[in-house]
């Protein structure tokens, strides 16, 4: 049933009223306001922005708006001792140094407190040695180097190009390979789209542009010093040596002008194939070390960054529900940026601001949502999702009992081609139905629905006439809500054409050139894509908070469970002999999925037919829907990843950004042919199959008739 049936709604105050109140011009104005100075986590400027947002959300009409603070480990460059990398000759003289900061964009030359490019949480150090080029530093790249090419990275400084996987995974892989330092660089092959000018004349990365970013491997822990618990005044803090997820070797990022100087001298082995070659005019030799004439030259890193416990601030706004105030729908996105945050995060924060304003307008006219809506402006997302994780740790007991859904709101755009949605299967039908009601902003789709343009441009690989919806991975603030707490989650933004633009992220990601002008001149001059994203995010929140029956369809979970079971079975079947030898069977898992499918189908029939006017029955059915996601949580967590507790989805162990299905089984099977003890390895596969089977069956039983 539609949200207009909620008892507290007058015909005037429906979804249409909420959507009609959203204005592109306001989003534009908010984005400009949020991007004039840097808002780095832990700085005074970001605290002042938090207070401004608190004040404005109150003006917009929220019931309460509070700042919540935590004292977490952050990382900054040393102001008087800059980080850089040198080429040194045999006498130890520096004959080339990488740049100390990015050339500032026009109009921003006199802005203070622009943090220079650095890899957050890099330890200090001055390693020197020969260079090895490791492509993207993915698991498979190190397999190629070590196993096929017999190149040893031990004691070497590795240079890796950004892209394909989360930078923290690159650093972890380099550490495991024995490297003494890591240089990360942006190759034009990945960050310079052909036919587009570099900033300020276009949206491509100039040669001096550099991607900042953290290099942690937190696996969902939050603040490295207080895993599992909020970093409050009485928190016990680990020592730095026991902190979670910190890298052990120095790391530093550079642009492609500087990378050219390092890579042009490379000698040693040739690159294995074209997939290892970027677009610079260099040979892309792997090394180790420089070629003949330069063989006595070495590379030296100079890293002096410091990690320090610093106060951060979330802004939490509440719009109390009229009927079910103890049921929470959360819309959250971060506020902290690396520099100006033109796209990341302020294109998202501006949308959240306008959504709050629209909800506030309705509330001032006497309306309330059925359920409570919480709005969050998270701090320190760029330093490891810290603000959201600490808040969720502090409020975990409330969230696990009352959390209906979490909608994420980081960058609204990463392109201007079509919609991109990642969410729990429970939200598929909500997203389909909503996008059918929204107008497409795309050229050539005037008067057509967003669903239609999205489906045309990003078709589902499995179902014709439907758009693609991806799995949730991580790398953003939904992580703690979905992967740790099991709260149904989703995210939406406008994206690029992945067919024609194969670069990773958008070229100016986390650089000084991510400005208001980048968005206004090149990505969304009319702010129509921002408005569409506001309608999708806001519309999802409206429906989740206002529908009499929660807009979750458990049958869609049944469909994907079967797909994921098929996929993991096919991976295992690449080892038929071992499966036979060790009696590995997926029969139990397929049986559990079948049971889930049948029970979900019956539940959906009951959901359709039950008496919606009976408040006890209604609450009971809604609770079964709300708690279904929770039922996929294993309290023991995944092996070596205690804060990743969702049995169906986890961030890939090889790329934090990507989602993996049946991750416990997947990781047990990964590279199993190389394990020294195959009996133990296949035993672990069997254990993981049993955990997955139990979890799917247990989740199914939560949908059974209660008595």
């Amino acid at each position: 049933k539609s949200s207009s049936e909620a008892t507290n709604i007058t015909p005037k105050h429906n979804m249409k009223a909420f959507l009609d109140e959203l204005k592109a011009e306001n989003i534009k104005k908010f984005l400009h306001n949020f991007t004039q100075i840097p808002h780095l986590a832990g700085t005074e400027q970001n605290f002042q922005l938090a207070k401004q947002i608190q004040s404005q959300w109150k003006e917009f009409g929220l019931d309460s708006v509070e700042l919540t603070h935590y004292d977490v480990l952050l990382s900054y460059p040393n102001k008087t001792h800059p980080n850089y990398i040198s080429i040194i000759n045999e006498d130890g003289n520096e004959i080339f140094n990488t740049s100390l900061f990015e050339p500032p964009p026009a109009g921003y030359e006199n802005v203070s407190d622009i943090v220079p490019p650095f890899s957050a949480f890099s330890p200090q150090g001055m390693p020197e040695g020969d260079l090895v080029y490791v492509n993207y530093a993915r698991t498979e790249d190190f397999f190629k180097l070590e196993r096929d090419m017999k190149i040893n990275c031990s004691g070497k400084i590795v240079i890796a190009r950004y892209g394909k996987v989360f930078r923290g995974n690159k650093v972890k892989n380099a550490q495991l390979a024995g490297a003494t330092g890591v240089i990360l660089y942006s190759d034009p092959a990945d960050y310079f789209a052909p036919g587009v000018k570099s900033y300020p004349d276009g949206w491509n990365l100039p040669g001096g542009g550099v991607q900042r970013g953290n290099i942690l491997n937190l696996n969902g822990a939050g603040d490295p010093l207080t895993p599992g618990y909020p970093a409050n005044e009485y928190a016990y803090r680990r020592g730095i040596a026991e902190a979670v997820g910190l890298p052990s070797i120095p790391v530093h990022p550079i642009g492609y002008y500087d990378a050219q100087k390092l890579l042009e001298k490379m000698g040693g082995s040739a690159s294995p194939d074209s997939s290892w070659r970027g677009s610079l005019k260099v040979p892309y030799n792997v090394g180790p070390g420089f070629t003949g004439n330069f063989s006595t030259q070495k590379v030296k890193m100079h890293i002096h960054s410091t990690s320090e416990v610093t106060r951060i601030y979330n802004v939490i706004g509440t719009l109390r529900g009229a009927v079910e105030p103890d049921r929470y729908v959360i819309l959250g996105g971060h506020r902290d940026s690396w520099v100006f945050g033109g796209i990341d995060p302020q294109s998202g924060a501006a949308v959240v601001h306008e959504i709050v304003r629209s909800f506030g307008t309705l509330k001032k006219e006497g309306w309330r949502p059925r359920r409570t809506i919480l709005f969050a402006s998270w701090d320190a997302e760029e330093f490891g999702l810290l603000g959201s994780t600490e808040w969720a740790e502090e409020n975990s007991r409330l969230l696990q009992e009352r959390g209906v859904a979490y909608i994420n709101a980081d960058s609204s755009i990463e392109g201007n081609y079509t919609l991109r949605v990642d969410c729990t299967p429970l939200m598929y039908s909500l997203v389909y139905n909503l996008t059918k009601e929204l107008e497409s902003p795309d050229e050539g789709f005037e008067g057509k629905s967003l669903y239609e343009s999205w489906t045309k441009k990003s078709p589902s690989p499995e179902f014709s006439g439907m758009p693609r919806i991806s799995k949730l991975g991580s790398g953003n603030d939904f992580e703690v809500f979905f992967q740790r707490l099991g709260i149904a989650s989703g995210r939406a933004r406008y994206t690029k054409n992945w067919e024609t633009n194969k670069f990773s992220s958008y070229p100016l990601y986390h650089s000084v050139y991510e400005t208001y002008e980048l968005v206004e001149k090149f990505y969304d001059p009319m702010f129509k894509y921002h408005l569409t994203v506001a309608q999708v995010r806001g519309g999802m929140v409206f429906e989740l908070a206002n529908s009499v029956v929660l807009p979750f369809d458990c049958r869609d979970y049944a469909v994907v469970l079967r797909k994921y079971a098929d996929k993991i079975y096919n991976i295992s079947m690449k080892h038929p002999q071992e499966m036979k030898t060790y009696s590995v069977s997926f029969d139990s898992l397929f049986s559990a999925v079948k049971n889930f499918t049948e029970i979900a189908s019956k539940f959906s029939e009951r959901l359709r037919d039950f008496d919606k006017s009976n408040p006890i029955l209604l609450r009971m059915m809604n609770d079964q829907l709300m708690f279904l996601e929770r039922a996929f949580i294993d309290p023991l967590g995944l092996p070596d990843r205690p804060f990743y507790r969702h049995v169906i989805y986890a961030p890939s162990s090889h790329n934090k950004y990507a989602g993996e299905s049946f991750p416990g089984i997947y990781d047990a099977l990964f590279d199993i042919e190389s394990k020294v003890d195959p009996s133990q390895a296949w035993g672990e596969v069997k254990r993981q199959i049993s955990i997955a089977t139990f979890t799917v069956q247990a989740a199914a039983e939560t949908l059974s008739e209660v008595a």
Epitope: P103, S198, G208, Y257
Partner: nanobody, 126 residues
Framework: EVQLVESGGGLVKPGGSLRLSCAAS????????MYWVRQAPGKGLEWVAV????????NYADSVKGRFTISRDNSKNTLFLQMNSLRVEDTAVYYC???????????????????RGQGTMVTVSS
């Protein structure tokens, strides 16, 4: 209007020192690689030193290496050349020159320069 104004030249004995300054206006120094070049009486223009936009890289002509130091203060929009152990052959008009915008070029000597100042005369004589 883009302007470069050099100062600090003068008469100095061999072995002496001078510090040249170059005040930039009409553009932000922070975005540009910067050069010192010189022209001895009756000779062509000779490149002396270059500094990248951020000061991370400095290159010198072999004839001045170890004696001259180029530096910059981006906050004051000023370029400097510290000249020690001066020799008679260092006598020349010294010009500061603006390199390519670092947003469009790497700021290395082979990028070349576009605008230079009026120059300041340095005379090394006993």
């Amino acid at each position: 209007e883009v302007q470069l104004v050099e100062s600090g030249g003068g008469l100095v004995k061999p072995g002496g020192s001078l510090r040249l300054s170059c005040a930039a206006s009409g553009f932000n120094l922070i975005s540009y690689g910067m050069y010192w070049v010189r022209q001895a009486p009756g000779k062509g223009l000779e490149w002396v030193a270059v500094i990248s936009y951020d000061g991370s890289n400095k290159n010198y002509a072999d004839s001045v290496k170890g004696r001259f130091t180029i530096s910059r203060d981006n906050s004051k929009n000023t370029l400097f050349l510290q000249m020690n152990s001066l020799r008679v052959e260092d006598t020349a008009v010294y010009y500061c020159a603006k390199g390519g915008n670092a947003l469009y070029s790497s700021g290395w000597p082979d990028d070349g320069f576009d605008i230079r100042g009026q120059g300041t005369m340095v005379t090394v004589s006993s």
